[in-house]
Amino acid sequence: FPQTTEKISPNWESGINVDLAISTRQYHLQQLFYRYGENNSLSVEGFRKLLQNIGIDKIKRIHIHHDHDHHSDHEHHSDHERHSDHEHHSEHEHHSDHDHHSHHNHAASGKNKRKALCPDHDSDSSGKDPRNSQGKGAHRPEHASGRRNVKDSVSASEVTSTVYNTVSEGTHFLETIETPRPGKLFPKDVSSSTPPSVTSKSRVSRLAGRKTNESVSEPRKGFMYSRNTNENPQECFNASKLLTSHGMGIQVPLNATEFNYLCPAIINQIDARSCLIHTSEKKAEIPPKTYSLQIAW
């Protein structure tokens, strides 16, 4: 997130520093489009991957286990609900739980940012050419860092599973079990400028199938790479920090225009797993009253 040396409140009667809001939104859009974009656009496939990785591409089965003793109907209802077929279809891709952190001064190879991530609150967008319509700062950056836009394919020899635990009054388990198909493409790690190693905890057996136009010296920017050990994960920003990082006051209500500026940051924070603590895969190591999901709001 950007850090500004300029005081926000005294300079902006409107309660929003629009320069900072635009620049911050653009930064988060660059992160997202670097990971999911291709050839100056966000393809349907890339958009689908983004939705999948933030967990809203399909209906998920949620198991709710309550700590208290009473057994009302709703406690077991979710286990018996019928779920739509698309939850189980085979075109699942691996849902990594590794951070996608970023540093604000990193020159990401940005992509075209079409108005797909956070649409305008007005309904009339019919007159816009989708190739021209980046919308409110969602624009098409050039390749400043000189890195080619290469995606890696991943082959997996086993079913992969991501389990997020939120342990509180009631324990909620969101289980997503997905099988990546060989040759499927994964988004790039925006933060890695040197070849990182594959994490030892990764359940992907190997990385393969690099595009032939990728230079030998270029780092592979696969979705499954662990972050470099000397880098910090992107901070989990709560509501106040999200607002101030966009040059917005925290005492005034948001209108739709102002909220629109925040959308890429919110999506990027979800996608980067910024607010998830990655606990050990051994369930026994999770203390009964700790949170693997930080309270961000």
Epitope: P2, T5, E6, V18, D19, H106, K128
Partner: antibody
């Protein structure tokens, strides 16, 4: 106090390149994008391009082939270079933190032999 | 590119009057419009952003309105120091584009 100060030549020969440096103070280039705009009597105000916080750039397609914007965050400087100038590129060139009131003082560039 | 049209190149008004400068976008730009005031020999000064948000230090006699394609800058109780050229600009789509300007003359 937010300021943008421009330095660059006032006269450029036809077919030569124009280089302008915009030195900013009161804010960080890692937090704000810096835009370039020019103004001429014939064409009014034209947005030329921007360099974003991470170093990526967006250019007006009409100028993309001959325009380059770069920066040095540590020196708080943004560098503007336009190649192959012609007489109709005569204008006042501004750097700005746009879309705000924070604009440079402008550099009047005359393209003439 | 989005064309921002300010149909009136010149407007004449008197001190104390109310005047409205209009700007029309060739396609929807939501509320992403800035109004600038430029006095001779000076850089443009932003008055309004996001169609209706007044910048700090801008007198409250300047108000902005509109959405989509039609936008208006209204100056109520015009003062002699308001003699200037006024530009609209959209920042919804790149390239950002400006209106041709409206020069306000004081009778």
């Amino acid at each position: 106090q937010v300021q943008l100060k421009q330095s660059g030549p006032g006269l450029v020969q036809p077919s030569q390149s124009l280089s302008i440096t915009c030195t900013v103070s009161g804010f960080s280039l890692t937090s704000y994008g810096v835009h370039w705009v020019r103004q001429s009597p014939g064409k009014g105000l034209e947005w030329l391009g921007v360099i974003w916080t991470g170093g990526t750039t967006d250019y007006n397609a009409a100028f993309k082939s001959r325009l380059s914007i770069s920066k040095d965050n540590s020196k708080s400087q943004v560098f503007f270079k336009m190649n192959s100038l012609q007489a109709n590129d005569t204008a006042i060139y501004y750097c700005a933190r746009g879309p705000s009131s924070y604009w440079g003082q402008g550099t009047l560039v005359t393209v003439s032999a | 590119d989005i064309v921002m049209t300010q149909s009136q190149k010149f407007m004449s008004t008197s001190v104390g009057d109310r005047v409205s400068v209009t700007c029309k976008a060739s396609q929807n730009v939501d509320t992403n419009v800035v109004w600038y005031q430029q006095k001779p020999g000076q850089s443009p000064k932003a008055l309004i952003h996001s169609t209706s948000y007044r910048y700090s230090g801008v007198p409250d006699r300047f108000t902005g309105s509109g959405s989509g394609t039609d936008f208006t800058l209204t100056i109520s109780n015009v003062q002699s120091e308001d003699l200037a050229e006024y530009f609209c600009q959209q920042y919804n789509n790149y390239p950002w584009t400006f209106g041709g300007g409206t020069k306000l003359e004081i009778k």
